[in-house]
């Protein structure tokens, strides 16, 4: 890893060991300076492996709302608009960090949590299982 | 929104307003109790819209390493294994939360930051722009 000299203006903390409790400013800075303003907005419908987005809400989590993708079919959509079951729709998943209120219902105390979310779907060639 | 009664055992905090500074335990809890144990491990290669994963490292960010997907082709792979430019490979993007050291180089003080990452690619039917 890269060692960075500590800034002398840092807030004081008792315990420098990991795991540790840190101070986090929840005033979110949005770094999305994306040169491609067209986002994945309609890809869910135009994809050969289309998906639907489901709202997952949990007031004990920050962010409280996360959108989960569910592939519409097990197969993929072909050029005729029909489902082709020689190909497979699969979810593209990503591990993301969220904040979980800990102790529960506390407005200003959290624990970092890793969750697996499905972001969309892609069409893949199936794995062929050869029978011995 | 859902109002939850505050737990009387919560740590004290000076400012209850948003934006606010909160305490976060960095001892990550992994909640991935997934009924689909098979993850997206090889989908990047088997997809009709294959992608490569690029390592994005930033020691001022937590997590410091994020993997970014970049679609290999503009078109999609057809049944013959060739690129079909009548279809488009597009990145599936997601906004995720990360922690940014603030002030810089501080080990225990962060600010929440939203960044846009490409998780994988999907094959979509192109938008046809009709010329008047």
């Amino acid at each position: 890893g890269i060692t960075i000299p500590r800034n002398p203006g840092c807030p004081n903390s008792e315990d420098k060991n990991f795991p540790r409790t840190v101070m986090v400013n929840l005033n979110i800075h949005n770094r999305n300076t994306n040169t491609n303003p067209k986002r994945s907005s309609d890809y869910y419908n135009r994809s050969t492996s289309p998906w639907n987005l489901h709202r997952n809400e949990d007031p004990e989590r920050y962010p409280s709302v996360i959108w989960e993708a569910k592939c519409r079919h097990l197969g993929c959509i072909n050029a005729d608009g029909n489902v082709d079951y020689h190909m497979n729709s699969v979810p593209i998943q990503q591990e993301i960090l969220v904040l979980r209120r800990e102790p529960p219902h506390c407005p200003n105390s959290f624990r970092l949590e890793k969750i697996l979310v499905s972001v969309g779907c892609t069409c893949v060639t199936p794995i062929v299982h050869h029978v011995a | 929104g859902i109002t939850i009664p505050r737990n009387p055992g919560c740590p004290n905090s000076e400012d209850k307003n948003f934006p606010r500074t909160v305490m976060v335990n960095l001892n990550i809890h992994n909640r991935n109790t997934n009924t689909n144990p098979k993850r997206s491990s090889d989908y990047y290669n088997r997809s009709t819209s294959p992608w490569n994963l690029h390592r994005n490292e930033d020691p001022e960010r937590y997590p410091s390493v994020i993997w970014e997907a970049k679609c290999r082709h503009l078109g999609c792979i057809n049944a013959d294994g060739n690129v079909d430019y009548h279809m488009n490979s597009v990145p599936i993007q997601q906004e995720i939360l990360v922690l940014r050291r603030e002030p810089p180089h501080c080990p225990n003080s962060f600010r929440l930051e939203k960044i846009l990452v490409s998780v994988g690619c999907t094959c979509v039917t192109p938008i046809v722009h009709h010329v008047a």
């Epitope: 419908n45 639907n52 987005l53 489901h54 709202r55 997952n56 989960e68 993708a69 569910k70 592939c71 519409r72 079919h73 097990l74 197969g75 489902v83 079951y85 497979n88 729709s89 699969v90 979810p91 998943q93 697996l116 499905s118 779907c121 893949v124 199936p126 794995i127 062929v128 299982h129 | 109790t33 997934n34 009924t35 689909n36 098979k38």
Partner: antibody, heavy 124, light 113 residues
Framework: QVQLQESGPGLVKPSETLSLTCTVS????????VSWIRQPPGKGLEWIGI???????DYNSAFKSRVTISVDTSKNQFSLKLSSVTAADTAVYYC??????????????????WGQGTLVTVSS | DIVMTQSPLSLPVTPGEPASISCKSS????????????LAWYLQKPGQSPQLLIY???TRQSGVPDRFSGSGSGTDFTLKISRVEAEDVGVYYC?????????FGQGTKVEIK
Amino acid sequence: QVQLQESGPGLVKPSETLSLTCTVSGFSLPSHSVSWIRQPPGKGLEWIGIIWNNGGTDYNSAFKSRVTISVDTSKNQFSLKLSSVTAADTAVYYCARNAYITDYYYENYFMDAWGQGTLVTVSS
Amino acid sequence: DIVMTQSPLSLPVTPGEPASISCKSSQSLLFSENQKNYLAWYLQKPGQSPQLLIYWTSTRQSGVPDRFSGSGSGTDFTLKISRVEAEDVGVYYCQQSYYTPYTFGQGTKVEIK
């Protein structure tokens, strides 16, 4: 608890359009998809189509040219329209909720809650 | 369309005895990505609408008694009732939820002898 209730005319004339409504309660419309299934008298079950949580639809190709499923979220109602009906469309029509399973990343096409069904007779 | 064939079509049973229904699919219902078989079982009691018993071949729906069990893979599936009770009478349907359109078997009528 979860409830689905079909309603609509019990008698439809041949060549006309069959219109049914399914009023639901006890579950979140944005999470669940709803299917329509029919059962001709003394026969088995036939899946007609589905409306997903985002309003998108998928139909059985046997009905594709004459079926429309829609939703009115403000009223918690789903509707089925089947045009150009014949005596062969006489059946009990059910609306049913498609199962929603957390941490499972595909839409489900099995149904975990059904309405009581409504008999529609096509006759002049 | 996928054809689902059930047997027997009629099954007279004795309370307390086991019962078994077979369902065969014209194509495999095993999805290679997650090794799940997309087969469900329903029971339609007399005068009622169908109720889900089992999905993914062997997963019991919440509230379904453990005397009901499902097994099989690919194209051949079985629903077993370990000890039939009087309330189990009705028509049992298998349904495949892999291929569109999602099709049902013709039904097996279970009645007390």
